[in-house]
Structure formats: C-alpha cells, structure tokens
C-alpha cells in the first residue's frame, strides 16, 4: 500500500530571465527512493539516480542545474518555460509517486505593470 505523500515548492510565478528552484519532498513512507525524474509535459529534463547520480538531458544542459538535493534549478527563464513540471519518485517497494508544479514565467512588462493589478 502506498502511504507516502509528495510535498512540492508550490506553484511559482517568476520573471523572464530569472532563475527558480523546483523541489519535491517525499514523506510518510519508509520506501527507498531509487530514482527521481523531472519532466515538463512529455519532455525529460533530468534524472537523479540513487546509484548513478544526475543526468541532465542534453537539450537542457545549458539552463538546468542539478539540486539542491533532489530538486532542480532552472536558469535564464523564458516564456517558453511556462508550464507544468513533474517530479516523479520511483521507490521500492511502493512504486511511483508524482508531484506537480506549475511555473508561470512573465514578461518583465507584465510582471511590473500587467493586468492592471494594484498593489497597495
């Protein structure tokens, strides 16, 4: 029976050009984490394997850094990075746990003035 739960950083709104950290944490289970995959839509960004360590997909190597911990750092954010990210924990004997984080990357003009939001 799968008793674990995944806690995430929560959804993030960030500005174009900045960097953010995506993190998940698996709790409430004694299962062993064998591998953590980070994916966006259907693309694999990175893998952290308990034995083999980190592998970053070649197409993301210049903007994705491993860590901290089992998390992932995204740098030089673009509007195209807006989307849903998944941390997929492969565990034994429980199986797979998945966390979801949505990243909203705003153009600088939107972040500063957009949507006629007023901040008192």
């Amino acid at each position: 029976m799968m008793t674990g739960t995944i806690e995430t950083t929560g959804n993030i709104s960030a500005e174009k050009g900045g960097s953010i950290i995506l993190q998940c944490h698996l709790s409430s289970t004694t299962a062993q984490v064998t591998q953590v995959n980070w994916e966006q839509q259907d693309q694999l960004l990175a893998i952290c394997n308990a034995d083999l360590g980190w592998h970053i997909s070649p197409s993301f190597k210049d903007r994705v850094a491993p860590g901290p911990g089992l998390g992932l750092t995204l740098q030089s954010l673009t509007v195209n990075d807006t989307g849903e990210y998944f941390c997929i924990y492969h565990t034994y004997p429980d199986g797979t746990y998945t966390g979801r984080i949505f990243l909203e990357v705003l153009e600088s003009s939107v972040a500063e003035h957009g949507a006629r939001f007023q901040i008192p």
Partner: antibody, heavy 117, light 112 residues
Framework: EVQLQQSGPELVKPGASMKISCKAS????????MNWVRQSHGKSLEWIGL????????SYNQKFKGKATLTVDKSSSTAYMELLSLTSEDSAVYYC??????????WGQGTSVTVSS | DVVVTQTPLSLPVSFGDQVSISCRSS???????????LSWYLHKPGQSPQLLIY???NRFSGVPDRFSGSGSGTDFTLKISTIKPEDLGMYYC?????????FGGGTKLEIK
C-alpha cells in the same frame, strides 16, 4: 480593454461532443495563460485545466482528463475547449478565464451547456 | 488535492453591516518563495465571477476599499466593511498555490 468573448449556449445529446470558443482581445494573447472553469447547477466552481497560448502546453485537472481537450489558435487569439462523450453530468456553465499570478483576473461571459436527449 | 473550506455557507446581512468570510485550506498556501496564491471572487446572479482580491490582500483594479483580505498559511479572511446592495451574491476563494487549483464551496451573502 481586456475582453473574453465566448460562444453561445449549446443543447447537445448524450454521447455527443462539442467545442466552446473564447476569443481574447485587448491584450497580448500569447503572454497569459488561459484557464477553463465550470459551474454545475447549484455547485461551486471547478477548475478544468489551462493552456499556454505561447506554446500550446496544457495542464488538466485529473477529473477532466479525457473529458476536455484544450487548444488555441494564435492567429485569431482564440482558445477552444472540446468536451467529449457528454453526459447529463456535464450540463453546466463553462467559463474561460485569464490567469495572472495564479489569480483569474478576467472572465468570459460563460457558455451554458445542456446535455439532454 | 488541496481542500478549501469556506464558512459560513450563508450570511444574512443588512445594508451597512460589516462582515467576514473565512477560507481554510488543508495545507499551507505559501510556496517556497514566500508567495501565497489565494484570491477572492464575487459571483453576482446573471454575471460572470469577478476578481476582488489576489495574493491574500491585494485589491484588483476598480475594487472598492471596503473589501479587504488577510491571513496566512492555511487561514484567510475576506472582510467587507460596509455592505452595499451591489455586494450581494456568492463569494468564492481560490487557492492557486498547488496543482490543481481548487475553489472553496462558496458563501452566499443575502439580505436578512
């Protein structure tokens, strides 16, 4: 002025599919996420999913996976939601809403969908 | 999914009253950067919902200052200082910090 103009009310038969449109104006369509939300009669609001018009990326509420498909046409600044295999449970008012900092700042006028034989 | 509980379900008021609506979430709505994505909406009969407050306490453009939001973590409040006829309707809170976003069940503000 930001506006989201939705297509008109629909009466459809059980088992049929249909598509609702949401035409955006007054802002840069590709610069903001578009959400879809529904309200069944006498119930609260439910988030269906979202689409990023910039790259077509989507995120769905698990409850609506296989029920709703979200697409956009950038050339006409229009978002679409196709509803599949409709049942009476899908009778509701459906809204498109613009997202900014995870708040829904502008809403379409709503599209009433009635599923009945 | 994060469960959002609104109280009360119904709030009978007289014009000029001050009222509070509570919204509680099953887990903290603060993300790792300290941002909390909690917003409030008013849904009037025959209209679309409209944004009142975003990010706990920021009033959206054009929203009168009789509306104010407060709270942190899992516990949030919308206050309306002097009820006017145009304030009647259903109020909803929305958490946008965790996927999927979830709405509260709503609070109906109606005349006594």
């Amino acid at each position: 002025e930001v506006q989201l103009q939705q297509s008109g009310p629909e009466l459809v038969k059980p088992g049929a599919s249909m598509k609702i449109s949401c035409k955006a104006s007054g802002y840069s369509f590709t610069g903001y996420i578009m959400n879809w939300v529904r309200q069944s009669h006498g119930k609260s609001l439910e988030w269906i999913g979202l689409i990023n018009p910039y790259n077509g990326g989507t995120s769905y509420n698990q409850k609506f996976k296989g029920k709703a498909t979200l697409t956009v046409d950038k050339s006409s600044s229009t978002a679409y939601m196709e509803l599949l295999s409709l049942t009476s449970e899908d009778s509701a008012v459906y809204y498109c809403t613009r997202l900014l900092r995870f708040a829904m700042d502008y809403w379409g006028q709503g599209t009433s969908v009635t599923v009945s034989s | 999914d994060v469960v959002v509980t609104q109280t009360p379900l119904s709030l009978p008021v007289s014009f000029g009253d001050q009222v509070s609506i509570s919204c509680r979430s099953s887990q903290s709505l603060a993300n790792s950067y300290g941002s909390t994505y909690l917003s409030w909406y008013l849904h009037k009969p025959g209209q679309s919902p409209q944004l009142l407050i975003y990010g706990i306490s920021n009033r959206f453009s054009g929203v009168p200052d009789r509306f104010s939001g407060s709270g942190s973590g899992t516990d949030f409040t919308l206050k309306i200082s002097t009820i006017k006829p145009e304030d009647l309707g259903m109020y909803y809170c929305l958490q946008g910090t965790h996927q999927p976003p979830t709405f509260g069940g709503g609070t109906k503000l109606e005349i006594k």
